[in-house]
């Protein structure tokens, strides 16, 4: 149903990393434009990305208001140049998105190893606490601020010349691993939310090896 020269959006997909959240859809518009609405289950609809020819809409500003809420979006299709026109049922064509709960579903961004410092046979490895777009009291919260103990990090490390990998986990952003003196090690980190059923792990951080500029060495 609807006007003959508009088609409903389809393949509505949430793309979200560290709470930066964009709704994408198809098709590329031909003689039509789109408006997006977003709502919590119990809230009112709020319109965004008015009469756009894009096939994506940044909804970050809305979802960061409460990342533990469940959100639903819908995409309306209008004829280009005649946005007052409606479908046969008296309203424009629209399609609903899947539900989206940012806290449970946003992808964990690729972590970065901020620094490593060797003191004797121990190496302190620090993973950067990435900033998110979630605000509290006018400051942006870090990933740790938002997830608290739900977020852990896993460190994979190995002797530079070896293939055997070891792992450690931490509830902070720091590791303190045992190494052999005079031996170079490489490592990468991964963010993990063990309690999740989807999107539990981030991609791996870039590999860092001892002897590179991020490291410090003390006897």
């Amino acid at each position: 149903s609807g006007t003959t020269n508009t088609v409903a959006a389809y393949n509505l997909t949430w793309k979200s990393t560290n709470f930066k959240t964009i709704l994408e859809w198809e098709p590329k518009p031909v003689n039509q434009v789109y408006t997006v609405q977003i709502s919590t289950k119990s809230g009112d609809w709020k319109s965004k990305c008015f009469y756009t020819t894009d096939t994506e809409c940044d909804l970050t500003d809305e979802i960061v208001k409460d990342v533990k809420q469940t959100y639903l979006a819908r995409v309306f299709s209008y004829p280009a140049g005649n946005v007052e026109s409606t479908g046969s049922a008296g309203e424009p064509l629209y399609e609903n998105s899947p539900e989206f709960t940012p806290y449970l579903e946003t992808n964990l961004g690729q972590p970065t190893i901020q620094s490593f410092e060797q003191v004797g046979t121990k190496v302190n490895v620090t993973v950067e606490d990435e900033r998110t777009l979630v605000r509290r009291n006018n400051t942006f919260l870090s990933l740790r601020d938002v997830f608290g103990k739900d977020l852990i990090y896993t460190l994979y490390y190995w002797k530079d010349s070896s293939t055997g990998r070891k792992t450690n986990t931490t509830h902070t952003n720091e590791f303190l691993i045992d190494v052999e003196k005079g031996v170079s090690y490489c490592f990468f980190a991964q963010a993990v939310i063990p309690s999740r059923t989807v999107n539990r792990k981030s991609t791996d951080s870039p590999v860092e090896c001892m002897g590179q500029e991020k490291g410090e060495f003390r006897e």
Partner: antibody
Framework: QVQLQESGPGLVKPSQTLSLTCTVS?????????WSWIRQHPGKGLEWIGE???????RYNPSLKSRVTISVDTSKNQFSLKLSSVTAADTAVYYC??????????????????WGKGTTVTVSS | EIVLTQSPGTLSLSPGERATLSCRAS???????LAWYQQKPGQAPRLLIY???TRQTGIPDRFSGSGSGTDFTLTISRLEPEDFAVYYC?????????FGGGTKVEIK
Amino acid sequence: QVQLQESGPGLVKPSQTLSLTCTVSGGSISSGQYWSWIRQHPGKGLEWIGEIYYSGSTRYNPSLKSRVTISVDTSKNQFSLKLSSVTAADTAVYYCARDAPYYYGGGYYYYMDVWGKGTTVTVSS
Amino acid sequence: EIVLTQSPGTLSLSPGERATLSCRASESVDSSYLAWYQQKPGQAPRLLIYGASTRQTGIPDRFSGSGSGTDFTLTISRLEPEDFAVYYCQQAGVVPYTFGGGTKVEIK
């Protein structure tokens, strides 16, 4: 040295809301620890209620989650517990505690290492 | 939730004797998350052991912890008068964090 002190009414009427505050002294509430509430029913064991990070991130015991709110006030170095719709079964000693990171096996894990003295709350009309 | 069962409920011993307290979990607990606490009457619990086997700063070496998986043990090698108290194991790996029911170590 960090010290914790619970405060709040010792008597609450059934169906009302229990409100307690824990004041942190000798350290900052924003220094990377978590802050917990635990209770102990008379002559019984310990029950974890929930915890909060300075940012406001919380975790609750699912058995109490529908009635519990834990909040933090970094400007006052305090965190608080609210437990709604109380009954006689909520009569207990309520403790606040610091959950601090300790090195273990290559990483850091959290343990409740500093506790308040506890405050007795009786639910009765 | 993970249920921690402590045994025995009460242990009657004399000063100088060895105390062995057991904590059994309903499912496997990562040692990293297992702690032991001591509580005396009218006082708050005190952290003794974390990571199943590491003594907290200031805790005498007569206290030791061991175990993995579902079976953990707290041992007091020679009981001192101040050791008579209730001891709780706790897991902090899975929400809700849970405590065992406690073992009371009393003077025989």
